[in-house]
Amino acid sequence: EVEKTACPSGKKAREIDESLIFYKKWELEACVDAALLATQMDRVNAIPFTYEQLDVLKHKLDELYPQGYPESVIQHLGYLFLKMSPEDIRKWNVTSLETLKALLEVNKGHEMSPQVATLIDRFVKGRGQLDKDTLDTLTAFYPGYLCSLSPEELSSVPPSSIWAVRPQDLDTCDPRQLDVLYPKARLAFQNMNGSEYFVKIQSFLGGAPTEDLKALSQQNVSMDLATFMKLRTDAVLPLTVAEVQKLLGPHVEGLKAEERHRPVRDWILRQRQDDLDTLGLGLQGGIPNGYLVLDLSMQEALS
């Protein structure tokens, strides 16, 4: 907290300019008018203030706007944004995408801070949903943003926004998140033809059900092993050897290297060894010939 002292003669700031970097903290407090600062916030970012000095400027704005800053000030905070606490940000009402971009730019190249997370949360809640432009902006600054949302939060993403999602944006998503995103992607890309559709839907397939994988196996998609390994185990298990062969195409040979890993391992255990042998890959662990497979889950459902 800077002590209240009178401004020395001739030092009263008439505008926000570079001369203020030579003011001591108490001089900034005494000689810079908060209203002047608020109207000339756009200049602050271009002036090489220390963070100690920015603390003083923040204090002045806090006194002027105890209920939270107006967006006209927020948009020009620049590096002063880094001095804000999540509590400060919760008082704001940020509605402009330009304001959001300006503040994210300040933190560019750094991991998401609590301030940024709070800002994004306030912005998205204010908009009511994660629209395409917002998602575009957020994933440009934070590729992992989408995967940081809960399935509940993801449910507010409209299918039209899915067009903004790049494969790398989904790298850290878990199956629960992909379960929510996949139906939206399916809806978003439904009017595309086979090969184009597969290119777009591929990164979302970790949320695909068995019937959709069966349908894809009829379309000569040649799914790569990396995508196959991210599929839901429960969706892969019911696939026949023939369907997996069609789904993977030339990549089917990669199953051998993955035979000890899920979902391949679990899928092998569900296949007849005879059928696995038709692949000629030397996959072992299937159901021996002559054994009868009873699906007890089906029996329980009927009784």
């Epitope: 090489p48 203030f49 220390t50 963070y51 100690e52 880094l82 933190n107 750094h110």
Partner: nanobody
Framework: EVQLVESGGGLIQPGGSLRLSCAAS????????MGWHRQAPGKELELVST???????YYANFVKGRFTISRDNSKNTLYLQMNSLRAEDTAVYYC?????????WGQGTLVTVSS
């Protein structure tokens, strides 16, 4: 984190010259601007000069025309060339880096101007 180590201080006669150096290490990519501050005995810390990443320089009125700030990016070093030194320039000189999201300071180097 950014680490700063100053050197080059010492005893010098009035009218003489000295060059201070400040070697920066650590997360130097996050540095926005750097500067030299000084604190004379019994006085407040004051800014002497600042230089931005694009090379824009600023000087306090009391050193204008006598001191020159510069940086060598290849050596990650900040300099302060001090000419026409006066007794009132006697102080501990501190190097400061303003980096994301705080200010980092060196331990200081003492400059004594005396005959």
């Amino acid at each position: 984190e950014v680490q700063l180590v100053e050197s080059g201080g010492g005893l010098i006669q009035p009218g003489g010259s000295l060059r201070l150096s400040c070697a920066a290490s650590g997360n130097i990519g996050s540095i926005r601007h750097m500067g030299w501050h000084r604190q004379a005995p019994g006085k407040e810390l004051e800014l002497v000069s600042t230089i931005t990443t694009v090379g824009t320089t600023y000087y306090a009125n009391f050193v204008k025309g006598r001191f020159t700030i510069s940086r060598d990016n290849s050596k990650n070093t900040l300099y302060l060339q001090m000419n026409s030194l006066r007794a009132e320039d006697t102080a501990v000189y501190y190097c400061r880096a303003t980096a994301h999201p705080t200010d980092y300071w060196g331990q200081g180097t003492l400059v004594t101007v005396s005959s």
